[in-house]
């Protein structure tokens, strides 16, 4: 890896700057893609900040860029003034640039902001040369709000600062009226102030009547040393421009402002409702707007006043639809700064908010969800609902366009069809099954993002309250007890204080579940069974006939059981017991209990010990106690009307408040 | 098509019984879990009793322990809340439900009045 560039970047006071491949290159002797050239902000600036064109401005510091984004333009230094004045300025970012598998190389990116620098967005080298509004006729006082030169003295260290001054050298005076230091008119023989009298307050400019035309002087600005002796230094030419007013004007009356809204790299008009001002006595051609800082996201542009932006226009221009705004491909909001003001009146601050649009949305579904059963309710997060565009938007809306079928949506506990981004964040809304007929459900939303909607369907699924262990392989050919060991729905039995059923959908594509006679003596052989009960895995009724599959050379296999659960209270779930079976090995302990193994391995063993016998289970794997009544929880069920009680029963949580009596075990 | 059906309600004095029937239509109550469920006007809803049809086990609320016994008969497919000793507070539209395998039905309600 190797930097090129001359890794200094020059800025304008209060202004932002891109860096450029003129700043900063670097290149790999693999002729990497720039994309893949990725710097690290180790140390950021001090006197400003680094952030990304496209990136909302207002975030986080940016870590990362790559040397893509510096040859888009897309990173961006800005200088934040300071409240004191200062003249040249030094900030240092510190980087370090990677590209795997090349070894990092740190760099030094310098910054100097400098008042010298020729800046087009601020032509004055002095910390201030607003200008100044005088009404007709009168005088008023230039103050240092109005023209400071204080960033000329800065340049002084300040052990020294004190004995110099700035001396202002007027080239030429204002000619509709006069300038006076402590009441002394200036003249040709007299042409000097200081900027100490300035701070002091001793500057006056007086009009002479006779009109409102502009008004105004130039001087030129240097530093003086220690008993007026000239030193070498800044210093500026420069225009101070005097506004003249009439007296008897009505200032105008800005109109509150609505944002204007559009989609990125568009273009859109500006009307009244995003500017106007109430002024009886100007025409829309005499109040003037000017722009005094724009937004990133794009610009100002009048329609037959060429391509390039614009920084002043008339509020004709707004009225005739002759201004727009044309948006770049950034996606983030910003505000213009507008000065506006009819030519008498001093000019009075406005604001135009611009807020870019998405050009589409997407309903990020990233999983369905997952009810857990004996809960019944789960809180959506963004897991299910999230939207981006070209970035993520955390102020959408939703809104339910088909309803779930078997339960409701709920933010603090009642139904609703309308929610927020930031409700789901905060885990406020709840889907809560209220008709416990169906291990899935749906629904339909519309999410609206900055004016632009997009549908999704979220899909909610139950997760069984079951433990299953299926453990190592199991053999073929044989039949094994299915117990608790192997499926347990006791937990579920604990908390719904009732039997939970089984019910077979799928499997096992090799075998068979079946009921084992209780004992020798019990008539009749292994019946096939698709359902059955925590009851039946507890009293060792069942067994799996694991079989071999067909049609290719005995070896390892995997096969699966797929069941429905369901319980008193809940939603049913569906849950698999996923297994791996193998050809019986007569010397390999199983971890499930065997209930018969293979015919011709019994006949090789000769022995009848070889197996356990198929009638007698072995011992039982869990207590004989049913799975019911073991404890005293209170149950929160919910029940909804099928038939026109859903009015009735909607989403209603009806408390179950019962120490659970224990049952006696029949057989 | 109509699933299940309550009959039984009516008018009692307090201390008298009453026996309310819930009669199911189109499916097998023999592996269902039945439950009793009460609205009294201007209260919320309760499960007053329920039953798993396959083992008996029965469940009920502290409110009418030893006075309400809920029952299944298969061989009618019926589901029945025997209740004694009634009292005013018993008052209110009794519904039977029926959960199982893929089914969740609601019965449309009979009224229970107890009053002197």
């Known amino acids: 890896l190797s930097l090129k560039g001359s890794q200094t970047l020059t800025v304008c006071p209060g202004s932002v700057q891109p860096l450029s491949s003129q700043t900063l290159r670097a290149s790999s002797s693999a002729g990497t893609d720039p994309q893949l050239l990725l710097y690290r902000v180790v140390r950021g600036p001090q006197l400003g900040r680094l952030f990304h064109a496209q990136q909302d401005s207002t975030g986080e510091a940016l870590v990362n860029f790559t040397q893509a984004e510096v040859y888009a333009g897309n990173i961006l230094y800005e200088h934040e003034m300071p409240p004191e004045p200062f003249w040249e300025a030094h900030d240092t970012l510190e980087l370090q640039l990677s590209s795997p598998p090349a070894r990092d190389v740190a760099a030094t990116l310098a910054v100097a902001v400098s008042f010298e620098a020729a800046c087009p967005q601020h032509p004055s080298h002095l910390w201030k040369n607003k200008g100044l509004w005088v009404p007709e006729g009168q005088r008023a006082r230039i103050t240092v709000a109005a023209l400071d030169a204080s960033n000329l003295l800065a340049s002084v260290p300040s052990p020294q600062r004190s004995e110099h001054d700035v001396l202002f050298q007027v080239t030429q005076f204002p000619s509709r009226g006069q300038l006076l230091v402590s009441e002394e008119p200036l003249h040709a023989g007299q042409p000097h102030f200081l900027q100490s009298q300035l701070a002091a307050g001793q500057l006056v400019y007086a009009h002479g009547g006779g009109g409102t035309q502009q008004d105004g002087f130039h001087f030129r600005a240097h530093l003086q040393g220690p008993a007026g002796a000239s030193v070498a230094g800044p210093q500026t030419s420069e225009a101070f421009a005097i506004t003249v007013r009439d007296v008897n004007e009505r200032p105008p009356q800005p109109q509150a402002s609505v944002p204007l809204r559009l989609t990125r790299g568009s273009r859109a008009p500006i009307s009244r409702a995003q500017l106007s001002v109430v002024d009886p006595d100007s025409a829309p051609g005499e109040i003037e707007y000017e722009v005094q800082r724009a937004p990133h996201n794009g610009f100002l542009s009048l329609v037959g006043g060429g391509l390039g932006p614009v920084t002043r226009f008339t509020q004709a221009d707004v009225d005739s639809g002759r201004l727009a705004f044309v948006a770049n491909g950034s996606s983030v909001a910003g505000i213009f700064q507008l000065s506006m003001s009819d030519g008498a009146s001093p000019p009075l601050p406005m604001s135009l908010a611009v807020d870019i649009l998405p050009s589409a949305i997407e309903v990020q579904l990233r999983a369905p969800l997952e009810v857990p059963q004996a809960l019944g309710r789960s809180s959506l997060s963004q897991q299910q609902l999230r939207v981006v565009s070209d970035r993520e938007e955390p102020e959408a809306a939703y809104r339910l366009i088909q309803g779930p079928q078997y339960g409701h949506l709920l933010v603090g506990g009642r139904p609703t069809s309308a929610f927020s981004q930031f409700q789901i964040d905060q885990g406020e809304v709840v889907f809560a099954f209220t008709n416990f007929s169906s291990s899935h459900d749906h629904f339909r939303v519309l999410a609206l993002a900055r004016g632009v909607n997009a549908s999704a369907v979220v899909n909610v699924t139950v997760r069984a309250l079951l433990h299953v262990w299926a453990g190592g392989p199991w053999p073929q050919g044989a039949t094994l007890r299915l117990d608790p060991t192997v499926l347990d729905a006791g937990e579920l039995a604990n908390r719904t204080g009732s039997v939970p059923r089984f019910r077979l959908l799928e499997g096992p594509r090799h075998g068979r579940v079946v009921r084992v006679p209780r004992a020798r003596t019990e008539p009749g052989g292994s019946q096939l069974v698709e359902q059955f009960t925590q009851q039946d895995l507890e009293d060792g009724r069942l067994g799996l006939e694991v079989g071999r599959p067909e049609g290719r050379a005995p070896g390892p296999a995997g096969d699966s059981l797929t069941l429905e659960l369901w319980a008193q209270g809940v939603p049913p779930a569906v849950a698999s017991l996923d297994f791996a079976t193998e050809p019986y090995n007569a010397a390999r302990p199983y971890s499930v209990a065997l209930l018969s193994v293979p015919e011709a391995a019994r006949t090789e063993a000769g022995k009848p010990e070889s197996s356990t016998p198929t009638g007698e289970p072995g011992p039982m794997a869990s207590s004989p106690e049913p799975a019911v009544a073991k404890g005293g929880v209170d149950e929160q069920l919910y029940f909804q009307g099928g038939s026109g009680l859903n009015d009735i029963f909607e989403a209603q949580k009806i408390e179950w408040h019962e120490a659970r009596a224990h049952h006696h075990h029949h057989h | 098509e109509v699933q299940l059906v309550e009959s039984g309600g009516g008018l009692v004095q307090p201390g008298g019984s009453l026996r309310l029937s819930c009669a199911a239509s189109?499916?097998?109550?023999?592996?269902?879990?039945i439950g009793w469920v009460r609205r009294a006007p201007g209260k919320g809803t309760e499960l007053v009793a329920s039953i798993d049809c396959i083992y008996g086990y029965t469940r009920y609320a502290d409110s009418v322990k030893g006075r309400f016994t809920i029952s299944c008969d298969t061989s009618k497919n019926t589901a029945y809340l025997q209740m004694n000793s009634l009292r005013a507070e018993d008052t209110a539209v009794y519904y039977c439900a029926a959960q199982g395998y893929r089914l969740h039905y609601w019965g449309q309600g009979t009224t229970v009045t107890v009053s002197s």
């Open positions: 189109s499916f097998n109550i023999k592996d269902t879990y």
